[in-house]
Protein backbone atom coordinates (compact mmCIF):
# COMPACT_ATOMS: atom_id res chain seq x y z
CA UNK A 1 0.00 0.00 0.00
CA UNK A 2 1.26 3.36 -0.86
CA UNK A 3 -0.14 6.85 -0.53
CA UNK A 4 -0.75 8.04 -3.76
CA UNK A 5 -2.24 11.81 -2.87
CA UNK A 6 -3.17 12.97 1.53
CA UNK A 7 -5.13 10.23 2.57
CA UNK A 8 -5.58 8.31 -0.87
CA UNK A 9 -3.72 5.48 -0.75
CA UNK A 10 -3.10 2.46 -3.63
CA UNK A 11 -3.47 -0.82 -2.64
CA UNK A 12 -1.91 -3.08 -4.49
CA UNK A 13 -3.72 -6.55 -5.45
CA UNK A 14 -3.08 -9.99 -7.14
CA UNK A 15 -6.02 -10.20 -8.83
CA UNK A 16 -7.42 -13.77 -9.36
CA UNK A 17 -9.97 -16.10 -8.00
CA UNK A 18 -9.65 -16.80 -4.70
CA UNK A 19 -7.09 -14.34 -4.01
CA UNK A 20 -6.29 -13.62 -0.45
CA UNK A 21 -5.82 -10.09 -1.06
CA UNK A 22 -3.78 -7.96 0.94
CA UNK A 23 -4.56 -6.57 4.70
CA UNK A 24 -4.89 -3.33 5.45
CA UNK A 25 -4.55 -1.01 8.72
CA UNK A 26 -6.29 2.52 8.96
CA UNK A 27 -5.73 4.19 11.53
CA UNK A 28 -8.24 7.40 12.90
CA UNK A 29 -6.20 10.43 12.45
CA UNK A 30 -7.51 11.78 16.54
CA UNK A 31 -6.11 11.88 19.68
CA UNK A 32 -9.04 10.21 20.82
CA UNK A 33 -8.39 6.59 22.21
CA UNK A 34 -12.42 4.77 22.39
CA UNK A 35 -15.50 5.63 21.26
CA UNK A 36 -14.20 5.66 17.97
CA UNK A 37 -16.30 3.64 15.05
CA UNK A 38 -15.91 3.01 11.43
CA UNK A 39 -18.25 3.45 8.27
CA UNK A 40 -17.42 3.38 4.46
CA UNK A 41 -18.69 5.37 1.89
CA UNK A 42 -22.12 6.41 2.67
CA UNK A 43 -23.33 3.92 4.29
CA UNK A 44 -24.01 3.60 8.39
CA UNK A 45 -23.13 -0.04 9.40
CA UNK A 46 -20.33 0.24 11.53
CA UNK A 47 -17.72 -2.14 10.12
CA UNK A 48 -15.78 -2.25 13.26
CA UNK A 49 -14.53 0.15 16.40
CA UNK A 50 -11.19 1.62 17.90
CA UNK A 51 -8.43 3.35 16.87
CA UNK A 52 -7.27 1.23 13.84
CA UNK A 53 -9.37 -0.75 11.64
CA UNK A 54 -8.35 -4.14 10.42
CA UNK A 55 -9.22 -4.89 6.93
CA UNK A 56 -8.57 -7.76 4.00
CA UNK A 57 -9.34 -6.28 0.63
CA UNK A 58 -9.75 -8.63 -1.79
CA UNK A 59 -12.36 -6.96 -4.29
CA UNK A 60 -13.80 -3.31 -5.14
CA UNK A 61 -16.10 -3.80 -2.86
CA UNK A 62 -13.69 -3.36 -0.16
CA UNK A 63 -12.24 -0.04 -1.26
CA UNK A 64 -13.82 3.44 -1.13
CA UNK A 65 -13.98 6.02 1.29
CA UNK A 66 -13.24 4.95 4.69
CA UNK A 67 -14.55 7.17 7.79
CA UNK A 68 -13.83 6.85 11.38
CA UNK A 69 -16.65 9.07 14.04
CA UNK A 70 -17.16 9.83 17.02
CA UNK A 71 -20.33 10.71 18.57
CA UNK A 72 -21.50 11.49 15.51
CA UNK A 73 -18.47 13.48 14.93
CA UNK A 74 -16.41 13.08 11.48
CA UNK A 75 -12.49 12.27 12.78
CA UNK A 76 -10.77 11.48 9.64
CA UNK A 77 -11.06 9.81 6.37
CA UNK A 78 -8.68 7.39 4.36
CA UNK A 79 -9.77 6.39 0.30
CA UNK A 80 -8.75 3.07 -0.35
CA UNK A 81 -8.31 3.02 -4.29
CA UNK A 82 -7.08 -0.82 -6.02
CA UNK A 83 -4.54 -1.25 -9.02
CA UNK A 84 -5.26 -4.83 -10.28
CA UNK A 85 -2.17 -6.95 -11.12
CA UNK A 86 -3.46 -10.20 -13.53
CA UNK A 87 -0.36 -12.55 -14.46
CA UNK A 88 1.71 -9.82 -12.92
CA UNK A 89 0.78 -7.31 -15.60
CA UNK A 90 -0.54 -4.36 -13.72
CA UNK A 91 -4.54 -3.51 -15.51
CA UNK A 92 -4.69 -1.47 -18.22
CA UNK A 93 -8.42 -1.26 -18.39
CA UNK A 94 -8.87 2.88 -18.15
CA UNK A 95 -6.92 3.74 -21.88
CA UNK A 96 -7.41 2.29 -25.07
CA UNK A 97 -4.28 0.80 -27.08
CA UNK A 98 -3.56 2.80 -30.03
CA UNK A 99 -1.49 0.06 -31.50
CA UNK A 100 0.53 2.37 -33.21
CA UNK A 101 3.45 2.07 -34.02
CA UNK A 102 2.84 -1.12 -31.64
CA UNK A 103 0.31 -3.30 -29.72
CA UNK A 104 0.49 -1.84 -26.05
CA UNK A 105 0.32 1.52 -26.71
CA UNK A 106 -1.78 3.96 -24.81
CA UNK A 107 0.43 7.08 -24.50
CA UNK A 108 1.32 8.66 -27.94
CA UNK A 109 3.43 11.84 -28.15
CA UNK A 110 5.03 13.83 -31.22
CA UNK A 111 7.22 16.99 -31.22
CA UNK A 112 6.81 19.47 -34.30
CA UNK A 113 10.93 20.51 -33.69
CA UNK A 114 13.85 19.53 -31.82
CA UNK A 115 12.91 22.79 -29.09
CA UNK A 116 12.13 19.98 -26.26
CA UNK A 117 8.26 20.56 -26.68
CA UNK A 118 6.14 17.92 -27.08
CA UNK A 119 2.59 16.20 -27.27
CA UNK A 120 1.08 13.47 -25.72
CA UNK A 121 -2.48 11.96 -25.76
CA UNK A 122 -4.32 9.00 -24.83
CA UNK A 123 -7.71 7.75 -25.67
CA UNK A 124 -10.41 6.58 -23.34
CA UNK A 125 -14.00 5.08 -23.85
CA UNK A 126 -14.65 6.42 -20.06
CA UNK A 127 -16.89 9.90 -19.58
CA UNK A 128 -17.27 10.92 -16.18
CA UNK A 129 -15.28 9.24 -13.05
CA UNK A 130 -12.03 9.96 -14.34
CA UNK A 131 -8.73 11.92 -13.08
CA UNK A 132 -5.71 12.48 -14.66
CA UNK A 133 -2.24 13.67 -13.46
CA UNK A 134 0.86 13.97 -15.77
CA UNK A 135 4.52 13.80 -14.65
CA UNK A 136 7.75 14.02 -16.85
CA UNK A 137 11.37 13.53 -16.99
CA UNK A 138 14.48 12.82 -18.96
CA UNK A 139 15.83 9.89 -17.96
CA UNK A 140 14.50 8.47 -14.63
CA UNK A 141 17.86 7.46 -12.19
CA UNK A 142 19.24 10.97 -11.90
CA UNK A 143 15.70 13.12 -13.79
CA UNK A 144 16.12 16.14 -15.44
CA UNK A 145 13.26 18.43 -15.40
CA UNK A 146 10.07 18.50 -17.80
CA UNK A 147 7.06 20.93 -17.05
CA UNK A 148 3.99 19.71 -18.73
CA UNK A 149 0.63 21.70 -18.47
CA UNK A 150 -3.18 20.80 -18.17
CA UNK A 151 -4.16 17.51 -19.75
CA UNK A 152 -7.29 18.71 -21.65
CA UNK A 153 -10.36 17.23 -23.18
CA UNK A 154 -8.62 17.38 -26.95
CA UNK A 155 -11.48 15.61 -28.84
CA UNK A 156 -14.27 13.35 -28.51
CA UNK A 157 -14.99 10.58 -31.34
CA UNK A 158 -18.18 8.55 -31.82
CA UNK A 159 -17.03 4.86 -32.93
CA UNK A 160 -19.34 2.83 -33.33
CA UNK A 161 -21.67 2.47 -30.02
CA UNK A 162 -19.18 4.29 -28.09
CA UNK A 163 -17.67 7.88 -27.28
CA UNK A 164 -14.38 7.56 -27.44
CA UNK A 165 -12.60 10.77 -25.45
CA UNK A 166 -9.15 12.01 -26.41
CA UNK A 167 -7.07 13.66 -23.58
CA UNK A 168 -3.83 15.24 -24.23
CA UNK A 169 -0.96 17.17 -22.77
CA UNK A 170 1.92 19.29 -23.88
CA UNK A 171 5.67 19.34 -22.25
CA UNK A 172 8.73 21.16 -22.16
CA UNK A 173 12.05 19.55 -21.28
CA UNK A 174 13.42 22.55 -19.03
CA UNK A 175 16.70 23.17 -19.94
CA UNK A 176 16.67 21.52 -23.81
CA UNK A 177 19.27 21.57 -26.08
CA UNK A 178 18.06 21.07 -29.68
CA UNK A 179 21.72 20.51 -31.44
CA UNK A 180 22.84 17.61 -28.70
CA UNK A 181 22.22 13.88 -29.43
CA UNK A 182 20.12 12.57 -26.91
CA UNK A 183 21.53 9.93 -24.63
CA UNK A 184 18.54 9.67 -21.94
CA UNK A 185 14.92 9.15 -22.89
CA UNK A 186 11.77 11.48 -22.07
CA UNK A 187 10.16 9.87 -19.41
CA UNK A 188 6.47 10.81 -19.15
CA UNK A 189 4.03 9.06 -16.49
CA UNK A 190 0.06 8.93 -16.56
CA UNK A 191 -1.57 8.22 -13.11
CA UNK A 192 -5.20 7.41 -13.94
CA UNK A 193 -7.99 6.86 -11.54
CA UNK A 194 -11.44 5.81 -12.65
CA UNK A 195 -13.89 5.34 -9.64
CA UNK A 196 -11.67 3.06 -7.25
CA UNK A 197 -9.19 1.33 -10.20
CA UNK A 198 -5.84 3.01 -9.95
CA UNK A 199 -3.63 2.59 -12.96
CA UNK A 200 -0.25 3.68 -14.52
CA UNK A 201 0.88 4.25 -17.92
CA UNK A 202 3.85 5.39 -18.69
CA UNK A 203 6.15 6.11 -21.95
CA UNK A 204 9.79 6.41 -22.80
CA UNK A 205 11.33 7.87 -25.99
CA UNK A 206 13.84 9.95 -27.15
CA UNK A 207 12.69 13.72 -29.03
CA UNK A 208 14.47 12.38 -32.23
CA UNK A 209 12.23 9.40 -32.31
CA UNK A 210 9.16 11.07 -31.93
CA UNK A 211 9.58 14.19 -34.29
CA UNK A 212 6.91 15.14 -36.78
CA UNK A 213 7.36 18.62 -38.57
CA UNK A 214 4.02 20.46 -39.31
CA UNK A 215 3.58 20.64 -43.36
CA UNK A 216 5.20 22.11 -45.93
CA UNK A 217 3.80 25.95 -46.07
CA UNK A 218 3.24 28.68 -49.08
CA UNK A 219 2.83 25.41 -51.56
CA UNK A 220 2.54 26.87 -54.89
CA UNK A 221 2.16 26.48 -58.29
CA UNK A 222 4.23 28.24 -61.48
CA UNK A 223 3.18 27.12 -65.14
CA UNK A 224 6.30 26.79 -67.18
CA UNK A 225 5.98 28.45 -70.64
CA UNK A 226 5.05 26.38 -73.69
CA UNK A 227 5.05 23.21 -71.24
CA UNK A 228 2.44 20.60 -69.11
CA UNK A 229 5.15 21.52 -66.48
CA UNK A 230 4.83 23.13 -63.57
CA UNK A 231 6.96 24.54 -61.03
CA UNK A 232 5.92 23.43 -57.71
CA UNK A 233 7.75 25.83 -54.42
CA UNK A 234 7.21 25.66 -51.10
CA UNK A 235 8.53 26.78 -47.86
CA UNK A 236 9.45 25.38 -44.36
CA UNK A 237 6.73 25.22 -41.89
CA UNK A 238 6.76 28.07 -39.06
CA UNK A 239 7.00 25.62 -36.12
CA UNK A 240 10.34 24.04 -37.79
CA UNK A 241 13.64 24.65 -35.68
CA UNK A 242 15.75 26.88 -37.19
CA UNK A 243 18.50 27.60 -39.03
CA UNK A 244 17.25 25.45 -41.98
CA UNK A 245 20.73 25.11 -42.84
CA UNK A 246 21.06 23.02 -40.01
CA UNK A 247 18.12 21.67 -38.83
CA UNK A 248 17.37 20.66 -42.74
CA UNK A 249 14.29 18.76 -44.30
CA UNK A 250 13.60 16.53 -47.22
CA UNK A 251 10.40 16.46 -49.43
CA UNK A 252 8.34 14.08 -51.32
CA UNK A 253 6.37 15.75 -53.68
CA UNK A 254 2.99 13.30 -55.30
CA UNK A 255 1.22 14.36 -57.97
CA UNK A 256 -2.12 11.92 -57.64
CA UNK A 257 -4.74 11.78 -60.19
CA UNK A 258 -8.65 12.04 -59.15
CA UNK A 259 -8.85 8.23 -59.19
CA UNK A 260 -6.78 6.49 -55.89
CA UNK A 261 -6.07 3.46 -58.46
CA UNK A 262 -4.01 5.99 -61.11
CA UNK A 263 -0.38 5.59 -60.43
CA UNK A 264 1.15 8.42 -58.39
CA UNK A 265 4.34 10.21 -59.19
CA UNK A 266 6.96 10.66 -56.83
CA UNK A 267 10.10 12.82 -56.46
CA UNK A 268 12.26 13.08 -53.59
CA UNK A 269 14.22 16.56 -53.18
CA UNK A 270 15.85 18.17 -50.28
CA UNK A 271 15.16 21.50 -52.69
CA UNK A 272 12.32 23.69 -51.76
CA UNK A 273 11.00 23.45 -55.55
CA UNK A 274 10.87 20.52 -58.39
CA UNK A 275 9.18 20.43 -61.74
CA UNK A 276 6.75 18.09 -62.22
CA UNK A 277 3.91 17.13 -64.88
CA UNK A 278 0.48 18.35 -63.95
CA UNK A 279 -2.34 16.50 -65.01
CA UNK A 280 -5.60 17.33 -65.91
CA UNK A 281 -7.71 17.28 -62.16
CA UNK A 282 -4.71 15.90 -60.39
CA UNK A 283 -3.60 17.37 -57.40
CA UNK A 284 0.16 18.20 -55.99
CA UNK A 285 1.30 16.96 -52.43
CA UNK A 286 4.40 17.74 -50.80
CA UNK A 287 5.18 16.56 -47.13
CA UNK A 288 8.14 16.81 -45.17
CA UNK A 289 10.83 14.89 -43.24
CA UNK A 290 13.48 15.26 -41.14
CA UNK A 291 16.77 14.97 -43.81
CA UNK A 292 19.11 13.12 -41.66
CA UNK A 293 16.95 11.31 -39.00
CA UNK A 294 14.21 8.67 -40.59
CA UNK A 295 11.15 10.12 -38.09
CA UNK A 296 7.72 11.00 -39.45
CA UNK A 297 7.03 12.26 -42.42
CA UNK A 298 4.18 15.12 -41.87
CA UNK A 299 0.85 15.39 -43.32
CA UNK A 300 0.85 16.71 -46.87
CA UNK A 301 0.08 20.02 -47.82
CA UNK A 302 -1.65 19.93 -51.28
CA UNK A 303 -2.71 21.91 -54.16
CA UNK A 304 -5.13 21.32 -57.01
CA UNK A 305 -3.34 21.12 -60.81
CA UNK A 306 -5.90 23.37 -62.03
CA UNK B 1 40.99 19.69 -43.19
CA UNK B 2 40.57 19.81 -39.56
CA UNK B 3 43.83 19.75 -38.57
CA UNK B 4 44.36 19.83 -35.04
CA UNK B 5 45.97 23.19 -35.79
CA UNK B 6 42.10 24.47 -36.22
CA UNK B 7 42.28 24.77 -39.98
CA UNK B 8 39.08 24.49 -41.63
CA UNK B 9 37.63 20.95 -43.13
CA UNK B 10 36.68 20.19 -46.21
CA UNK B 11 32.94 21.22 -45.23
CA UNK B 12 30.90 20.42 -48.33
CA UNK B 13 33.29 16.92 -49.18
CA UNK B 14 32.87 16.06 -45.26
CA UNK B 15 28.48 17.37 -46.14
CA UNK B 16 28.09 14.50 -49.03
CA UNK B 17 30.13 11.86 -46.95
CA UNK B 18 27.72 12.48 -43.67
CA UNK B 19 24.88 12.81 -45.49
CA UNK B 20 25.52 9.43 -47.08
CA UNK B 21 26.35 7.73 -43.46
CA UNK B 22 23.05 8.73 -42.86
CA UNK B 23 21.33 6.88 -45.74
CA UNK B 24 23.75 4.05 -45.01
CA UNK B 25 23.03 3.77 -41.34
CA UNK B 26 19.28 3.84 -42.13
CA UNK B 27 19.53 0.75 -44.61
CA UNK B 28 21.70 -1.31 -42.89
CA UNK B 29 18.87 -1.07 -39.89
CA UNK B 30 15.76 0.72 -41.13
CA UNK B 31 13.19 1.32 -38.21
CA UNK B 32 11.07 -2.26 -38.00
CA UNK B 33 7.75 -0.95 -36.78
CA UNK B 34 9.57 1.18 -34.14
CA UNK B 35 11.43 -1.83 -32.17
CA UNK B 36 11.98 -0.26 -28.95
CA UNK B 37 15.60 -1.89 -27.97
CA UNK B 38 15.48 0.34 -24.88
CA UNK B 39 13.06 -2.17 -23.54
CA UNK B 40 15.60 -5.05 -24.03
CA UNK B 41 17.31 -4.51 -20.90
CA UNK B 42 21.17 -4.69 -21.33
CA UNK B 43 21.22 -0.36 -21.07
CA UNK B 44 25.19 -1.13 -20.55
CA UNK B 45 26.38 -2.07 -23.96
CA UNK B 46 25.44 1.15 -25.84
CA UNK B 47 25.94 3.59 -22.54
CA UNK B 48 29.45 3.94 -23.21
CA UNK B 49 29.31 4.88 -26.69
CA UNK B 50 30.43 8.91 -27.14
CA UNK B 51 27.31 10.96 -27.64
CA UNK B 52 27.06 14.55 -29.14
CA UNK B 53 26.12 16.48 -25.80
CA UNK B 54 25.60 19.96 -25.17
CA UNK B 55 28.75 21.80 -24.06
CA UNK B 56 30.69 20.32 -27.25
CA UNK B 57 30.11 22.90 -29.24
CA UNK B 58 28.38 21.41 -32.48
CA UNK B 59 25.16 23.89 -32.25
CA UNK B 60 25.32 26.63 -34.65
CA UNK B 61 26.53 29.39 -32.41
CA UNK B 62 29.41 26.98 -31.06
CA UNK B 63 30.37 26.46 -34.27
CA UNK B 64 30.85 30.23 -35.22
CA UNK B 65 32.72 29.94 -32.31
CA UNK B 66 35.04 27.82 -33.03
CA UNK B 67 34.04 24.41 -34.24
CA UNK B 68 37.70 22.63 -33.59
CA UNK B 69 35.97 21.19 -30.41
CA UNK B 70 32.97 19.59 -32.19
CA UNK B 71 34.80 18.45 -34.92
CA UNK B 72 37.33 16.56 -32.39
CA UNK B 73 33.88 15.30 -30.81
CA UNK B 74 32.77 13.67 -34.29
CA UNK B 75 36.30 12.55 -35.02
CA UNK B 76 36.30 10.54 -31.69
CA UNK B 77 32.94 9.26 -32.47
CA UNK B 78 33.49 7.93 -35.98
CA UNK B 79 37.04 6.27 -34.94
CA UNK B 80 34.57 4.52 -31.95
CA UNK B 81 31.76 3.19 -34.72
CA UNK B 82 34.37 2.01 -37.39
CA UNK B 83 36.18 0.43 -34.35
CA UNK B 84 32.67 -1.68 -33.37
CA UNK B 85 31.88 -1.89 -36.79
CA UNK B 86 35.01 -3.91 -37.88
CA UNK B 87 34.82 -6.01 -34.35
CA UNK B 88 33.41 -9.33 -33.60
CA UNK B 89 30.03 -8.15 -33.19
CA UNK B 90 29.91 -7.56 -36.38
CA UNK B 91 32.07 -10.22 -38.03
CA UNK B 92 31.15 -12.79 -36.01
CA UNK B 93 28.04 -15.29 -36.37
CA UNK B 94 25.32 -14.54 -37.33
CA UNK B 95 27.17 -13.31 -40.48
CA UNK B 96 25.88 -10.39 -42.56
CA UNK B 97 24.56 -10.81 -46.02
CA UNK B 98 26.86 -9.80 -48.70
CA UNK B 99 24.88 -7.36 -49.80
CA UNK B 100 24.65 -5.63 -46.07
CA UNK B 101 25.71 -2.09 -46.28
CA UNK B 102 27.49 -2.29 -42.81
CA UNK B 103 30.49 -2.87 -45.11
CA UNK B 104 30.03 0.29 -47.04
CA UNK B 105 29.07 2.12 -43.78
CA UNK B 106 32.06 1.06 -41.92
CA UNK B 107 33.96 2.34 -44.94
CA UNK B 108 32.66 4.98 -45.12
CA UNK B 109 33.13 6.46 -41.35
CA UNK B 110 36.71 5.53 -41.77
CA UNK B 111 36.70 8.02 -44.91
CA UNK B 112 35.04 11.10 -43.18
CA UNK B 113 37.12 10.24 -39.81
CA UNK B 114 39.98 10.53 -42.43
CA UNK B 115 39.16 13.79 -44.20
CA UNK B 116 38.67 14.99 -40.65
CA UNK B 117 42.35 14.26 -39.60
CA UNK B 118 44.74 13.62 -41.94
CA UNK B 119 47.48 10.83 -41.45
CA UNK B 120 49.78 12.62 -39.15
CA UNK B 121 47.96 14.18 -36.76
CA UNK B 122 46.36 12.88 -33.99
CA UNK B 123 43.48 13.77 -31.60
CA UNK B 124 42.68 11.40 -28.48
CA UNK B 125 40.17 8.37 -29.52
CA UNK B 126 38.19 7.36 -26.91
CA UNK B 127 38.57 3.72 -25.52
CA UNK B 128 36.01 1.44 -26.95
CA UNK B 129 34.60 -0.58 -24.85
CA UNK B 130 35.30 -4.78 -24.34
CA UNK B 131 32.14 -6.28 -25.75
CA UNK B 132 32.09 -9.42 -26.32
CA UNK B 133 28.51 -11.28 -26.37
CA UNK B 134 28.82 -15.06 -26.21
CA UNK B 135 25.57 -15.65 -28.06
CA UNK B 136 24.45 -15.09 -31.60
CA UNK B 137 21.30 -13.53 -30.59
CA UNK B 138 23.02 -11.55 -28.17
CA UNK B 139 25.30 -10.43 -30.85
CA UNK B 140 22.67 -9.61 -33.00
CA UNK B 141 20.52 -7.54 -30.55
CA UNK B 142 23.80 -5.46 -29.85
CA UNK B 143 23.81 -5.04 -33.54
CA UNK B 144 20.90 -2.92 -33.75
CA UNK B 145 21.55 -1.16 -31.09
CA UNK B 146 24.57 -0.01 -32.36
CA UNK B 147 23.22 0.94 -35.36
CA UNK B 148 20.23 2.97 -33.28
CA UNK B 149 22.86 4.76 -31.81
CA UNK B 150 25.08 5.21 -34.55
CA UNK B 151 21.72 6.83 -36.57
CA UNK B 152 21.33 9.74 -34.15
CA UNK B 153 25.08 10.35 -34.02
CA UNK B 154 25.42 10.94 -37.95
CA UNK B 155 21.83 12.90 -37.91
CA UNK B 156 23.94 15.15 -35.87
CA UNK B 157 27.47 15.27 -37.49
CA UNK B 158 25.46 15.76 -41.03
CA UNK B 159 23.74 18.84 -39.49
CA UNK B 160 27.16 19.97 -38.60
CA UNK B 161 28.90 19.62 -41.67
CA UNK B 162 25.52 20.90 -43.76
CA UNK B 163 25.47 23.78 -41.47
CA UNK B 164 29.04 24.70 -41.84
CA UNK B 165 29.09 24.07 -45.61
CA UNK B 166 26.40 26.41 -45.93
CA UNK B 167 27.48 29.00 -43.04
CA UNK B 168 31.37 28.54 -42.59
CA UNK B 169 32.92 27.37 -46.27
CA UNK B 170 35.51 30.00 -47.27
CA UNK C 1 -3.78 31.72 -1.99
CA UNK C 2 -6.36 29.82 -3.40
CA UNK C 3 -10.18 30.68 -2.58
CA UNK C 4 -13.10 29.13 -3.09
CA UNK C 5 -16.36 31.06 -2.09
CA UNK C 6 -19.92 29.91 -2.62
CA UNK C 7 -22.96 32.51 -2.51
CA UNK C 8 -26.82 31.76 -3.52
CA UNK C 9 -27.48 29.20 -0.11
CA UNK C 10 -31.04 30.70 2.13
CA UNK C 11 -34.19 29.48 3.00
CA UNK C 12 -36.58 28.52 0.18
CA UNK C 13 -40.06 26.41 -0.03
CA UNK C 14 -40.22 23.11 -1.68
CA UNK C 15 -40.35 22.70 -5.44
CA UNK C 16 -38.42 26.10 -5.42
CA UNK C 17 -35.71 26.73 -7.51
CA UNK C 18 -32.08 28.26 -6.13
CA UNK C 19 -28.94 29.07 -8.26
CA UNK C 20 -25.79 28.17 -6.12
CA UNK C 21 -22.22 30.14 -7.37
CA UNK C 22 -18.78 29.46 -6.07
CA UNK C 23 -15.65 32.07 -7.38
CA UNK C 24 -12.28 30.77 -7.19
CA UNK C 25 -9.02 32.74 -7.08
CA UNK C 26 -5.80 32.58 -6.48
CA UNK C 27 -5.41 30.15 -9.62
CA UNK C 28 -7.27 29.64 -12.53
CA UNK C 29 -9.20 26.05 -13.03
CA UNK C 30 -9.82 26.38 -16.24
CA UNK C 31 -8.28 22.77 -16.86
CA UNK C 32 -10.00 21.08 -13.47
CA UNK C 33 -13.02 19.40 -12.40
CA UNK C 34 -15.07 21.44 -9.83
CA UNK C 35 -17.73 20.21 -8.32
CA UNK C 36 -20.38 20.81 -5.21
CA UNK C 37 -20.65 18.55 -2.65
CA UNK C 38 -23.37 18.54 0.72
CA UNK C 39 -23.39 17.56 4.42
CA UNK C 40 -26.50 17.46 5.90
CA UNK C 41 -26.69 17.80 10.00
CA UNK C 42 -25.32 14.52 11.28
CA UNK C 43 -24.36 12.82 8.27
CA UNK C 44 -21.42 12.48 6.14
CA UNK C 45 -20.29 14.65 3.32
CA UNK C 46 -21.97 13.66 -0.14
CA UNK C 47 -20.84 14.28 -3.56
CA UNK C 48 -23.78 16.29 -5.65
CA UNK C 49 -22.42 17.00 -9.06
CA UNK C 50 -19.00 17.50 -10.78
CA UNK C 51 -18.04 19.05 -14.20
CA UNK C 52 -14.52 18.78 -16.39
CA UNK C 53 -12.46 21.45 -16.87
CA UNK C 54 -14.11 22.71 -20.72
CA UNK C 55 -17.36 21.82 -18.92
CA UNK C 56 -18.58 19.19 -21.49
CA UNK C 57 -18.66 16.37 -19.07
CA UNK C 58 -20.70 16.40 -16.01
CA UNK C 59 -22.05 14.05 -13.24
CA UNK C 60 -24.77 13.30 -11.05
CA UNK C 61 -25.51 12.10 -7.38
CA UNK C 62 -28.89 9.65 -8.09
CA UNK C 63 -30.79 11.99 -5.92
CA UNK C 64 -30.26 14.77 -7.78
CA UNK C 65 -30.29 13.68 -11.59
CA UNK C 66 -32.72 15.46 -13.55
CA UNK C 67 -33.52 18.12 -11.31
CA UNK C 68 -29.76 19.63 -10.63
CA UNK C 69 -27.79 21.92 -13.32
CA UNK C 70 -24.22 22.02 -12.89
CA UNK C 71 -22.43 24.73 -15.28
CA UNK C 72 -18.77 26.78 -15.30
CA UNK C 73 -18.10 30.68 -16.57
CA UNK C 74 -14.35 29.82 -16.87
CA UNK C 75 -13.69 33.38 -18.03
CA UNK C 76 -15.61 34.32 -14.50
CA UNK C 77 -13.36 31.28 -12.66
CA UNK C 78 -16.87 30.34 -11.71
CA UNK C 79 -18.76 26.72 -11.41
CA UNK C 80 -22.91 27.51 -10.71
CA UNK C 81 -25.67 24.89 -9.22
CA UNK C 82 -28.97 25.22 -10.62
CA UNK C 83 -31.44 23.66 -8.06
CA UNK C 84 -35.03 23.59 -9.47
CA UNK C 85 -37.82 21.24 -7.64
CA UNK C 86 -36.44 21.26 -4.57
CA UNK C 87 -37.35 19.01 -1.54
CA UNK C 88 -36.86 19.14 1.91
CA UNK C 89 -33.93 16.63 1.72
CA UNK C 90 -32.09 18.62 -0.26
CA UNK C 91 -31.35 20.68 3.15
CA UNK C 92 -27.47 21.05 4.00
CA UNK C 93 -24.65 22.64 3.69
CA UNK C 94 -23.34 22.98 0.31
CA UNK C 95 -19.76 22.92 -0.43
CA UNK C 96 -17.82 24.02 -3.52
CA UNK C 97 -14.67 22.01 -4.46
CA UNK C 98 -11.66 22.13 -7.17
CA UNK C 99 -9.14 19.70 -8.41
CA UNK C 100 -5.50 19.98 -8.97
CA UNK C 101 -6.21 16.76 -11.39
CA UNK C 102 -7.56 16.49 -14.92
CA UNK C 103 -10.21 14.70 -16.55
CA UNK C 104 -13.86 14.42 -15.13
CA UNK C 105 -13.25 14.57 -11.71
CA UNK C 106 -14.44 12.10 -8.91
CA UNK C 107 -17.28 11.57 -6.69
CA UNK C 108 -14.98 11.10 -3.75
CA UNK C 109 -13.86 14.09 -2.07
CA UNK C 110 -10.91 13.27 -0.78
CA UNK C 111 -9.82 13.16 -4.24
CA UNK C 112 -10.43 17.48 -4.33
CA UNK C 113 -7.31 19.76 -2.70
CA UNK C 114 -9.37 22.63 -2.19
CA UNK C 115 -12.71 23.73 -0.31
CA UNK C 116 -15.00 26.56 -0.24
CA UNK C 117 -16.38 27.23 3.43
CA UNK C 118 -20.31 26.33 2.33
CA UNK C 119 -23.57 28.04 1.76
CA UNK C 120 -26.05 26.86 3.87
CA UNK C 121 -29.65 25.71 1.61
CA UNK C 122 -32.35 25.39 3.49
CA UNK C 123 -35.67 23.81 2.02
CA UNK C 124 -38.82 24.09 4.15
CA UNK C 125 -42.09 21.73 3.68
Known amino acids: IWELKKDVYVVELDWYPDAPGEMVVLTCDTPEEDGITWTLDQSSEVLGSGKTLTIQVKEFGDAGQYTCHKGGEVLSHSLLLLHKKEDGIWSTDILKDQKEPKNKTFLRCEAKNYSGRFTCWWLTTISTDLTFSVKSSRGSSDPQGVTCGAATLSAERVRGDNKEYEYSVECQEDSACPAAEESLPIEVMVDAVHKLKYENYTSSFFIRDIIKPDPPKNLQLKPLKNSRQVEVSWEYPDTWSTPHSYFSLTFCVQVQGKSKREKKDRVFTDKTSATVICRKNASISVRAQDRYYSSSWSEWASVPCS | RAVPGGSSPAWTQCQQLSQKLCTLAWSAHPLVGHMDLREEGDEETTNDVPHIQCGDGCDPQGLRDNSQFCLQRIHQGLIFYEKLLGSDIFTGEPSLLPDSPVGQLHASLLGLSQLLQPEGHHWETQQIPSLSPSQPWQRLLLRFKILRSLQAFVAVAARVFAHGAATLSP | EVQLVESGGRLVQAGGSLRLSCAASGRTFDSNPMGWFRQAPGKKREFVAI????????NYANSVKGRFTISRDNAKNTIYLQMNSLKPEDTAVYYC??????????????????WGQGTQVTVSS
Open chain 3, 97 to 114: AASGLYGSGSVYDLMYDY
Open chain 3, 51 to 58: ISGNGGIT
